[in-house]
């Protein structure tokens, strides 16, 4: 009779196991093993038992110990089982963000392992055990369903395969795929909300604020703003589940003409977006020509007034005739023109709204000098010893110089207060002097004598 | 009936060479494992080396690891000990054993002394 | 390497005595002890492998036992013959080792 010893084995893959072979009877004509793998016969003393070290065993197998004694020839089984850990275990790929609300589909492949029997196919969140099937087909596959909520956002998806060869006195042999670390968010189907100027002037600056609510998790919101081609360094506050991007915007003559401002939030792998046009116009303020800005009295002068092509203006409250960027009106300087302002207002159109601009010169009109008896009376009658004080006033731009001497030598204090005395009483003459020339008038004081009773 | 013969052993000065050879007989070889197992005079057992003459896939003890070469000519059921560079440690008997994990046979033994 | 002790290093007893020898590994070797009995100028004879099987032609009081670090052989009844070194060996790992030996004397 044959027997083997172990009859039953377990054993890593690519391992080695010693087999005995012994035979009941003492002289045995033949006592061997049949196998495919690799063996080495470890020698004993004796004839009814044999050692084999077979290495190398990759599958299940079945050695069979074979004696031939003289009752008769016998065999005995060994069954060799194998056992290795999979060679893959991984979740099929995943877009990292999901949105709340969705159902994720967590796909495992188990490549390899054996025995298939005790290998069991695990899907977890965490720690917690969403799904577990034993290990079936080649690679073996299982799925699981999971409706994506908010508490989810950070969790780690696994696969875990477990190889349980602790009925066979071994251990529980564990191996666990990469994990999937889920990005969950909300991101609402509203549109942000985009508020900038809806025209902008060449060189000048102005402020975008684009913002959106409802939003999960905030802080992994990104916001993109840009007007045409020029990208925009918003600055971003976020609240409990929204936020608020703003950024300055400068323009200049380039980017002149109908310009695309947009605000595009991304989360996860969604984004919304608001388009909105800004007109970039140029409008420099209407220019105001005068012949001379400074003309003598008498000059004719004319006064222009120019702007954008596409504006109207008005010179002075007077639209130009026919409407449109040029006014100009004539004049013969006079003093009163001296001062004079000249206004120009021009009205440009720019999408829809209307921007004005204005521009005023001053005329200055070089006259005089002149003396006249409104200003400078010629004739004074004062009584002695009364306090008086002598006016001449000239007249003039520039503004004249003005002297009263009498005999050339003694002055009438002009605008001071003086007591009268009989030293004032004469002719004076008041000489008025510019650049623009010079005029004299006569001016008499007559000196009042107290009457003495 | 499976036996084992060594011969080579001798006299060596140190740092000289000496070759052992085992020439078994009962069985062949290839089938199994032969090794080398020494002891020194009055002293203890000490393992030396292991062939497999299948493959020749050789296990040295580190202290002789570089100085000892094992080899097996299967067409002759022999194998060999080759020492080099001898040290006056080596000196010991000499058995060439067989089996896996344990030794179910053993020669006779061959003497080596190293002295100079 | 795995060192092997063996206890004690030398014992007398008297013929029919039980005589019992240990030997402990530095690490645990499972069942990879094999015990030897070398007498003076002779090779050593295996006389159990595998720390309890037994060998065709080894007597039957010649008994083994033990697994992990500590293991134990055990000669039942002490005959003359039985007056020699005895070893144990380790297979559990590269290189093999063997105990210092236990000289059995006539008390």
């Known amino acids: 009779q044959t027997s083997v010893s172990p009859s039953k084995v377990i054993l890593p893959r690519g391992g080695s196991v010693l087999v005995t072979c012994s035979t009941s009877c003492d002289q045995p004509k033949l006592l061997g093993i049949e196998t495919p793998l690799p063996k080495k016969e470890l020698l004993l003393p004796g004839n009814n038992r044999k050692v084999y070290e077979l290495s190398n065993v990759q599958e299940d197998s079945q050695p069979m110990c074979y004696s031939n004694c003289p009752d008769g020839q016998s065999t005995a089984k060994t069954f060799l089982t194998v056992y290795w850990t999979p060679e893959r275990v991984e979740l099929a790929p995943l877009p990292s963000w999901q949105p709340v609300g969705k159902n994720l589909t967590l796909r495992c492949q188990v490549e390899g392992g054996a025995p298939r029997a005790n290998l069991t196919v695990v899907l977890l969140r965490g720690e917690k055990e969403l799904k577990r099937e034993p290990a079936v087909g080649e690679p073996a596959e299982v799925t699981t369903t999971v409706l994506v909520r908010r508490d989810h956002h950070g969790a780690n998806f696994s696969c875990r395969t477990e190889l349980d060869l602790r009925p066979q006195g071994l251990e529980l042999f564990e191996n666990t795929s990469a994990p999937y670390q889920l990005q969950t968010f909300v991101l609402p189907a509203t549109p942000p909300q985009l508020v900038s100027p809806r025209v902008l002037e060449v060189d000048t600056q102005g402020t975008v604020v684009c913002s959106l609510d409802g939003l999960f998790p905030v802080s992994e919101a990104q916001v993109h703003l840009a007007l045409g081609d020029q990208r925009l360094n918003p600055t971003v506050t976020y609240g409990n589940d929204s936020f608020s991007a703003k950024a300055s915007v400068s323009v200049t003559a380039e980017d002149e003409g109908t310009q695309r401002l947009t605000c595009a939030v991304i989360l996860g792998n969604q984004s919304q977006e608001t388009l909105q046009t800004v007109t970039i116009y140029s409008f420099p303020a209407p220019n105001v020509i005068l012949t001379k800005p400074e003309v003598s009295e008498g000059t004719e002068v004319t006064v222009k007034c120019e702007a954008h092509p596409r504006a109207k203006v008005t010179l002075n409250g007077v639209p130009a005739q026919p409407l449109g960027p040029r006014a100009q009106l004539l004049l013969k300087a006079t003093p009163e023109d001296n001062g004079r302002s000249f206004s120009c207002s021009a009205t440009l159109e720019v999408a829809g709204q209307l921007i004005h601009k204005n521009q005023t010169r001053e005329l200055r009109v070089l006259y005089g000098p002149r003396l006249d008896e409104r200003d400078c009376p010629g004739n004074w009658t004062w009584p002695e010893n009364s306090q008086q004080t002598p006016m001449c006033q000239a007249w003039g731009n520039p503004l004249p110089e003005l002297k009263c001497l009498k005999d050339g030598t003694f002055p009438l204090p002009i605008g001071e207060s003086v007591t009268v005395t009989r030293d004032l009483e004469g002719t004076y003459l008041c000489r008025a002097r510019s650049t623009q020339g010079e005029v004299t008038r006569k001016v008499t004081v007559n000196v009042l004598s107290p009457r003495y009773e | 009936e499976v036996q084992l013969v060594e011969s080579g052993g001798g006299l060596v000065q140190p740092g000289g060479s000496l070759r052992l050879s085992c020439a078994a007989s009962g069985f062949n070889i290839k089938d199994t494992y032969i090794h080398w197992v020494r002891q020194a005079p009055g002293k203890g057992l000490e393992w030396v080396a292991r062939?497999?003459?299948?493959?020749?896939?050789?296990i040295y003890d580190p202290k002789v690891q570089g100085r000892f070469t094992i080899s097996a000519d299967d067409s002759k059921n022999t194998a060999y000990l080759q020492m080099n560079s001898l040290r006056a440690e080596d000196t010991a008997v000499y058995y060439c054993t067989t089996s896996g994990y344990w030794f179910a046979y053993w020669g006779q033994g061959t003497l080596v002394t190293v002295s100079s | 390497d795995i060192q092997m002790t063996q206890s004690p290093s030398s014992l007398s007893a008297s013929v029919g005595d039980r005589v019992t020898i240990t030997c402990r590994a530095s690490?645990?070797?499972?069942?990879?002890l094999h015990w030897y009995q070398q007498k003076p100028g002779k090779a050593p004879k295996l006389l159990i492998y595998h720390a309890s099987q037994s060998i065709s032609g080894v007597p039957s009081r010649f008994s083994g036992s033990g697994s992990g670090t500590d293991f134990t052989l055990t000669i039942s009844s002490l005959q003359p013959e039985d007056f020699a070194t005895y070893y144990c060996q380790q297979s559990n790992s590269w290189p093999y080792t063997f105990g210092q030996g236990t000289k059995v004397e006539i008390k």
């Open positions: 062939i497999d003459p299948a493959n020749d896939n050789t």
């Open positions: 690490q645990s070797i499972s069942n990879n």
